[in-house]
Interface confidence: medium
């Protein structure tokens, strides 16, 4: 892949269920907008949801809420479908990348059939491809999973901005 992460974070949820990803950030990013996006191609990533201040935002089945006091923001994906599986970015709205995954972290979302038991193992995305001179990652996620017994009849799409 094109991300120099030794352990990209993976999170899994059941079809029809929901999952939440908590993305942490440094205090210098407290006042900036936070976003969640799905990169359609390398170096390009259209935002699905983005915070505006501390108010929560929703776009279809995806919501985002910033918690500046905790230096984290939470993205929740609801009524999961198999099409929701794939790579996403957790990011901070700044012009800068000090490293390609800062302040953006790659999150791999997996969706499994409802009723299947699987463990979601949150991994800290702090690796780099070479020996770091300074820990470059300033955003890191953790995950919680919420199971839902039945799939939603109207799953819809996770993102509206498709290029």
């Amino acid at each position: 892949g094109y991300f120099p992460l030794s352990h990209p974070m993976t999170v899994a949820g059941p079809v029809g269920g929901s999952l939440s990803v908590q993305c942490r950030y440094e205090k210098e990013h407290r006042t900036l907008n936070k976003f969640w996006c799905r990169p359609p191609q390398i170096l390009r990533c259209d935002k699905i949801v983005e915070t505006k201040g501390s108010a929560g935002k929703r776009n279809g089945r995806v919501s985002i809420r910033d918690s500046p006091a905790n230096l984290s923001f939470t993205v929740t994906l609801e009524n999961l479908t198999e099409e929701d599986a794939g790579t996403y970015w957790c990011g901070v709205d700044t012009p800068w990348l000090r490293d390609f995954h800062d302040p953006i972290v790659e999150v791999e979302v997996s969706v499994f059939p409802a009723g299947t038991t699987t463990a979601s193992s949150p991994q800290s995305s702090m690796g780099t491809s070479g020996p770091p001179t300074k820990l470059p990652v300033h955003t890191w996620p953790s995950v919680t999973r919420k199971d839902s017994p039945e799939p939603s009849p109207h799953p819809g799409s996770l993102f509206s901005n498709v290029r």
Partner: antibody, heavy 116, light 110 residues
């Protein structure tokens, strides 16, 4: 096709003002940080300014701080650079570029000439 | 703000391997993993060749490769072709919310 198109360049006297525009198409403009980079005739590239996707964060090179203002109108898919108190050394081709600290899409540039 | 140091010129014959260096400081190149390289053909806008030290965007031939060690980065071009004749610039983020470019290297294919 992802495209950036600059306009607004021209001849201006020292001390004068000019506003450059950069029209974006082919991508969701509000999702991306934008930059202005300039290149004096026969010289190298110089980063000028940057703005975050939402427009909430702006940054400037020391050489233009206090004189230039970067802004964007996401409803019009347009990036701007307001240049005041222009000096002869500001003469350059000005490029707009898109990306998070690296520029993977560039416009063709617009020439600004500051001369009396 | 200063510029990253690049040799003003480099040259090679078709088929050769050429390397262009880019030297910064511990505040920019040495501290961050986002050295980018740009190619500027005569009369055109720059084009991204390498990002994040050694990653190639799609469409860039694998003849172009990047590396970084300490406060220096390098761009290597193998199997040199006449169409590679251009100016090459390195770039790095700095800790003071700014981008630095190198002075540029004019590559001549003999």
């Amino acid at each position: 096709e992802v495209q950036l198109l600059e306009s607004g360049g021209g001849l201006v006297q020292p001390g004068g003002s000019l506003r450059l525009s950069c029209a974006a198409s082919g991508f969701t403009f509000s999702s991306y940080a934008m930059h202005w980079v300039r290149q004096a005739p026969g010289k190298g590239l110089e980063w000028v300014s940057a703005i975050s996707g939402s427009g909430g964060s702006t940054y400037y090179a020391d050489s233009v701080k206090g004189r230039f203002t970067i802004s964007r109108d996401n409803s019009k898919n347009t990036l701007y650079l307001q240049m005041n108190s222009l000096r002869a050394k500001d003469t350059a081709v000005y490029y707009c570029a898109s990306g998070y600290g690296l520029m993977d899409v560039w416009g063709q540039g617009t020439l600004v000439t500051v001369s009396s | 703000q200063s510029v990253l140091t690049q040799p003003p010129s480099a040259s090679g014959t078709p088929g050769q391997r050429v390397t262009i260096s880019c030297t910064g400081t511990s505040s920019d190149v040495g501290n961050y993993n986002l050295v980018s390289w740009y190619q500027q053909l005569p009369g055109t806008a720059p084009k991204l060749l390498i990002y994040s030290n050694n990653q190639r965007p799609s469409g860039v031939p694998d003849r172009f490769s990047g590396s970084k060690s300490g406060t220096s980065a390098s761009l290597a071009i193998s199997g040199l072709r006449s169409e590679d004749e251009a100016d090459y610039y390195c770039s790095s983020y700095t800790g003071s919310n700014a981008l630095l470019f190198g002075g540029g290297t004019k590559l001549t294919v003999l």
